[in-house]
């Protein structure tokens, strides 16, 4: 057992058929010795009387909140929590699999520009009775610092019958260099708490395998006389880290007709402006990804050929 | 510790093309590497991130771009003297600071040099024949350090008596590839911004 | 007061289907688990299994599973436990009884329902 | 799964008497064990459980020991409405268990 925050515990429990429960030991935060009784959650029933309590904590129904009283007067609140283990497995039952990039990813993260600052996010299908803490550091035997804000749900998707819930949290390391070559990577913790069930959750990370810029900005087509080419002309996004001669990115131009299947033609260039050809009904699209350090490329940003 | 924004000569500038040359090869040698050792601990994830170059060279601090000398994160720099004369450095208006950048570059090149070849004599040795060092790698090492051609002592190459431990070498490589890499994208970056200043 | 109030007797053929009920008044239903023993005539106490009244978790019996179903309906505050198939050697009294959380024994205990299979 | 042999099978005592009944577990249970006692034609009741607290509403004649795998029951003064069958069951580990139960009787 162990304590998450003031007055609220976690009970790890090995969940198999077999295993037997955990006890535990609930002591009145009281100087008072006599006339306590305890209670848990909203029943007024008596479990036990003393300035202790031991219980043996082997299902959810075990778990909650225990208050001690004297008469009639709340002297002090325990909560606890369960994390199962089972198989030698810890729980991941309140978050989704993402999948991405890889089998049980729970967490992704992505940053705009080398400044330490990202934001992650997950996913889940509970809809109440649900909190989220997160925590994180630069490396995890001498931790550097990051702050994090609070978890906040920034998205809802109807997925076949199931709603889909993505919660995100922005964070930022307290003394990032842009440019300083990352040998400690990045933890992030997640405290996951669904009614009594407590799960946590971890991702660790490089900022720069992680970085996706925002899409080029004002992506303008100018005709070129007597030709059906136009150039195409762009900027770095404002989010971009800078000085951009030192942050370079590279881009990526695309002709798409109307129809998904017609052939797209690509070209690749390290300008912010390229020629090519403008089909009728076809659009435009470019995309950017850091010049030297092959992570996701951004969004497409697109304008239509007429 | 910081590059002021210089105004070399157009074109003056011939180690762009050797520094994207560097970083080309050593990414191509990294994912030829995860590939070949793809059941030894060889990812980014696996491994541990070591920098020889640390407290040797400090090249980061060295090469920073002026725009970033005002972010204090990035000014913990080490004081490490460095012989400045190159022929990187087209134009006499280059100053002091760009010197000991460049400088730092060659010094790092130098050891992963000679890690590299030492490295290799002991891959040729393995009677599983393996991995091998990527000689077009070796080869644009050298070519970038005679561009930057600075005068410095040699490193003579490490020998070893004792014979080697293949499995542990290989994962040294996937160390050293990893570590490489990232020094290569600095040493772009730099020479990016050297080249537009 | 604490009550658990179990359907009258039943007397069935084998083969056929049941389904027995124990109400509970008198606390916070979804707070307790509730279980459910076994009594053959003239011997002990066997415990089937328990089942949460929040959730439908469900802890049976290795030997009882398969054999019964455990359920509950919150908005009644009811449980139940039914056969599909009775036997002969279903022939018992059956007690539900409540989970004292914490803890893990029965604290209170239904009147019994004796459920007799005979052809 | 856990096995609680109760001893003996039958206990004969006269009113006012101390009675003590034993139960053994085939592995340790630690104090997760809990007495009922049962009356011909009533459900059981809750006499003490985690080896030795008294359930609420329960006379304090009736006390329990133990812990591991040795367990007791003690009636310090049997009453006449104290002769029943009296079952301990184990609750440390899936499936709870009982003892096949002691009968105690009016010599």
């Known amino acids: 057992i162990w304590e998450l925050k003031k007055d609220v515990y976690v009970v790890e429990l090995d969940w198999y058929p077999d295993a037997p429960g955990e006890m535990v030991v609930l002591t009145c935060d009281t100087p008072e010795e006599d006339g306590i009784t305890w209670t848990l959650d909203q029943s007024s029933e008596v479990l036990g009387s003393g300035k202790t309590l031991t219980i043996q904590v082997k299902e959810f129904g075990d778990a909650g909140q225990y208050t001690c009283h004297k008469g009639g007067e709340v002297l002090s609140h325990s909560l606890l929590l369960l994390h199962k283990k089972e198989d030698g497995i810890w729980s991941t039952d309140i978050l989704k699999d993402q999948k991405e990039p890889k089998n049980k990813t729970f967490l992704r993260c992505e940053a705009k520009n080398y400044s330490g600052r990202f934001t992650c996010w997950w996913l889940t299908t509970i809809s109440t009775d649900l909190t989220f803490s997160v925590k994180s550091s630069r490396g995890s035997s001498d931790p550097q610092g990051v702050t994090c804000g609070a978890a906040t749900l920034s998205a809802e998707r109807v997925r076949g019958d199931n709603k889909e819930y993505e919660y995100s949290v922005e964070c930022q390391e307290d003394s990032a260099c842009p440019a300083a070559e990352e040998s400690l990577p990045i933890e992030v913790m997640v405290d996951a708490v669904h009614k009594l069930k407590y799960e946590n959750y971890t991702s660790s990370f490089f900022i720069r395998d992680i970085i996706k810029p925002d899409p080029p900005k004002n992506l303008q087509l100018k005709p070129l006389k007597n030709s059906r080419q136009v150039e195409v002309s762009w900027e770095y996004p404002d989010t971009w880290s800078t000085p951009h001669s030192y942050f370079s990115l590279t881009f990526c131009v695309q002709v798409q007709g109307k129809s998904k299947r017609e052939k797209k033609d690509r070209v690749f260039t390290d300008k912010t402006s390229a020629t090519v050809i403008c089909r009728k009904n076809a659009s435009i699209s470019v995309r950017a990804q850091d010049r030297y350090y092959s992570s996701s490329w951004s969004e497409w940003a697109s304008v239509p050929c007429s | 510790r910081n590059l002021p924004v210089a105004t070399p000569d157009p074109g003056m500038f011939p180690c762009l093309h050797h520094s994207q040359n560097l970083l080309r090869a050593v990414s191509n040698m990294l994912q030829k590497a995860r590939q070949t050792l793809e059941f030894y601990p060889c990812t980014s994830e696996e491994i541990d991130h070591e920098d020889i170059t640390k407290d040797k060279t400090s090249t980061v601090e060295a090469c920073l771009p002026l725009e970033l000398t005002k972010n204090e994160s990035c000014l913990n720099s080490r004081e490490t003297s460095f012989i400045t004369n190159g022929s990187c450095l087209a134009s006499r208006k280059t100053s002091f600071m760009m010197a000991l950048c460049l400088s730092s570059i060659y010094e790092d090149l130098k050891m992963y040099q000679v890690e590299f070849k030492t490295m290799n004599a002991k891959l040729l040795m393995d009677p599983k024949r393996q991995i091998f060092l990527d000689q077009n790698m070796l080869a644009v090492i050298d070519e970038l350090m005679q561009a930057l051609n600075f005068n410095s002592e040699t490193v003579p190459q490490k020998s070893s008596l004792e014979e080697p431990d293949f499995y542990k070498t290989k994962i040294k490589l996937c160390i050293l590839l990893h570590a490489f890499r990232i020094r290569a994208v600095t040493i772009d970056r730099v020479m990016s911004y050297l080249n537009a200043s | 007061e604490v009550q658990l109030v179990q359907s009258g007797a039943e007397v069935k053929k084998p083969g056929e289907s049941l389904k027995i009920s124990c109400q509970s008044s008198g606390y916070t239903f979804t707070s307790y688990w509730i279980g459910w023993v076994r009594q053959m005539p003239g011997q002990g106490l066997e415990w089937i299994g328990i089942?949460?009244?929040?959730?439908?978790?469900?802890r049976y019996n290795p030997m009882f599973r398969g054999q019964v179903t455990m359920s509950v309906d919150k908005s009644s505050s009811t449980a139940y436990l039914q056969w599909s198939s009775l036997k002969a050697s279903d022939t018992a009294m059956y007690y539900c009884?409540?989970?004292?959380?914490?803890?893990?024994?029965?604290?209170?205990w239904g009147q019994g329902t004796m459920v007799t299979v005979s052809s | 799964e856990i096995v609680l042999t109760q001893s003996p099978a039958t206990l004969s005592a006269s009113p006012g008497e101390r009675a003590t009944i034993s139960c053994r577990a085939s592995?340790?249970?630690?104090?997760?064990v809990a007495w009922y006692q049962q009356k011909p034609g009533q459900a059981p009741r809750s006499l003490i459980y985690?080896?030795?607290n008294l359930q609420s509403g329960i006379p304090a004649r009736f006390s329990g020991s133990g812990s591991g795998t040795d367990f007791t029951l003690t009636i310090s003064s049997l009453e006449p409405e104290d002769f029943a069958v009296y079952y301990c069951?184990?609750?440390?580990?899936?499936?709870?268990?009982f003892g096949q139960g002691t009968r105690l009787e009016i010599k």
């Open positions: 009884a409540r989970r004292r959380p914490g803890q893990g024994y029965f604290d209170f």
């Open positions: 592995q340790s249970v630690g104090t997760w």
């Open positions: 985690a080896a030795s």
């Open positions: 089942m949460s009244p929040v959730d439908s978790d469900i």
């Open positions: 069951q184990q609750y440390n580990i899936y499936p709870y268990t």
